[in-house]
């Protein structure tokens, strides 16, 4: 990468070399020949998160309570407030700008992963021997009920929307 | 007491590489830039870059760009200088040099050097 | 690039004399300049910086001066351990840069 004029944390600026802003302050004025450079802390819901020379600070993001969302981690004036959603919902986008509805696994199938505030219900098909028979975001797949270890007999099989049917052994000989 | 302590003299073809070593003692390595200065024989003294111990980041002057490559070991306090390609007019005793404070400097790039290593000989020769 | 030029490039001087040797930038780097000894075979040593400020465990008969771009190195009542190379160097921006060098002889 090409040369440069200034040591890390400092940028050029009428051929002399100022101290950038630290995290959470702006700066005010470039530094002169005589004079450091002027920075100011950030205000209320504000921030800057890196060393800078910004004449203006960030807004903090607002947890739109509209969209579903709310405050995952407060601000600082060092870093941004993250958003996460609601209970029941998951956010749209990394930025989690706004939420939606966690999914839920439709009968035959069974919640592999349940959802969290960034990540939507992940759903896997009942295997042969499991079965769901709800339309769930927390269920999983159910293992058949095993006949045999109730002394009973399969009357009607599983589907992996269906439990078997179990009932009592013929006696007719 | 402050201490930098450098390999000894090389003795190297043309095309070749050569990588000097430089460990410090006697202070914090990570809190001051490590710079690399060469002085060809008979000659003045020739500003070759510098590395943050701290980041690694990394800054050669123009004549070097492309063949040099500064690097540390902050495990071992100790700051390299790898110079590719050599050419005969590569002789020279290669110094490093230990920087002001980080966070000292407030409106230049006060780049005084305090403590020399007692510098590598590095012949390129045919 | 900021171009160093120091004059003259060599000097002869008795012990107990006064000598000055000048450094001219190529443009403003007020405050930012050093001054280096240098004695055959040994690394440099930092003598003065920011113009003006004597390192640590310098004698005071060494003396830095100048602004803008015109500096100079005062060694008063020269003592036989001064008689080495002096170069410049400034420390406004990168690349650094180094004067030529004014080698002190004994006359």
């Known amino acids: 990468e090409p040369p440069t004029a200034c040591r890390e944390k400092q940028y050029l600026i009428n051929s002399q070399c100022c101290s950038l802003c630290q995290p959470g302050q702006k700066l005010v004025s470039d530094c002169t020949e005589f004079t450091e450079t002027e920075c100011l802390p950030c205000g209320e819901s504000e921030f800057l998160d890196t060393w800078n020379r910004e004449t203006h600070c960030h807004q903090h993001k607002y947890c739109d309570p509209n969209l579903g969302l709310r405050v995952q981690q407060k601000g600082t004036s060092e870093t941004d407030t993250i958003c996460t959603c609601e209970e029941g919902w998951h956010c749209t986008s990394e930025a989690c700008e706004s939420c939606v509805l966690h999914r839920s696994c439709s009968p035959g199938f069974g919640v592999k992963q349940i959802a969290t505030g960034v990540s939507d219900t992940i759903c896997e098909p009942c295997p042969v021997g499991f079965f769901s028979n709800v339309s769930s975001a927390f269920e999983k797949c159910h293992p058949w009920t095993s006949c045999e270890t109730k002394d009973l007999v399969v009357q009607q099989a599983g589907t992996n929307k269906t439990d078997v049917v179990c009932g009592p052994q013929d006696r007719l000989r | 007491q402050v201490q930098l302590v450098q390999s000894g003299a090389e003795v190297k073809k043309p095309g070749a590489s050569v990588k000097v070593s430089c460990k410090a003692s006697g202070y914090t390595f990570t809190g001051y830039y490590m710079h690399w200065v060469r002085q060809a024989p008979g000659q003045g003294l020739e500003w070759m870059g510098w590395?943050?111990?701290?980041?690694?980041?990394?800054n050669y002057a123009q004549k070097f760009q492309g063949r040099v490559t500064m690097t540390r070991d902050t495990s071992i306090s100790t700051a390299y200088m790898e110079l590719n390609r050599l050419r005969s007019d590569d002789t020279a005793v290669y110094y490093c040099?230990?920087?002001?404070?980080?966070?000292?400097?407030?409106?230049?790039?006060?780049?005084?050097?305090?403590?020399w290593g007692q510098g590598t000989l590095v012949t390129v020769s045919s | 690039d900021i171009q160093m030029t120091q004059s003259p490039s060599s000097v002869s001087a008795s012990v107990g004399d006064r000598v000055t040797i000048t450094c001219r930038a190529t443009?403003?780097?007020?405050?930012?300049l050093a001054w280096y000894q240098q004695r055959p075979g040994k690394a440099p040593q930092l003598l003065i910086y920011r113009t003006s400020t004597l390192q640590s465990g310098v004698p005071s008969r060494f003396s830095g001066s100048g602004s803008g771009t015109d500096f100079t190195l005062t060694i008063s009542n020269l003592q036989p351990e001064d008689f080495a190379t002096y170069y410049c160097?400034?420390?406004?921006?990168?690349?650094?840069?180094f004067g030529q060098g004014t080698r002190l002889e004994i006359k």
């Open positions: 040099a230990r920087d002001q404070p980080l966070g000292y400097c407030t409106n230049g790039v006060c780049s005084y050097f305090d403590y």
């Open positions: 160097q400034h420390a406004k921006i990168f690349p650094i840069t």
């Open positions: 590395i943050n111990p701290d980041s690694g980041g990394t």
């Open positions: 443009q403003d780097i007020r405050p930012w």
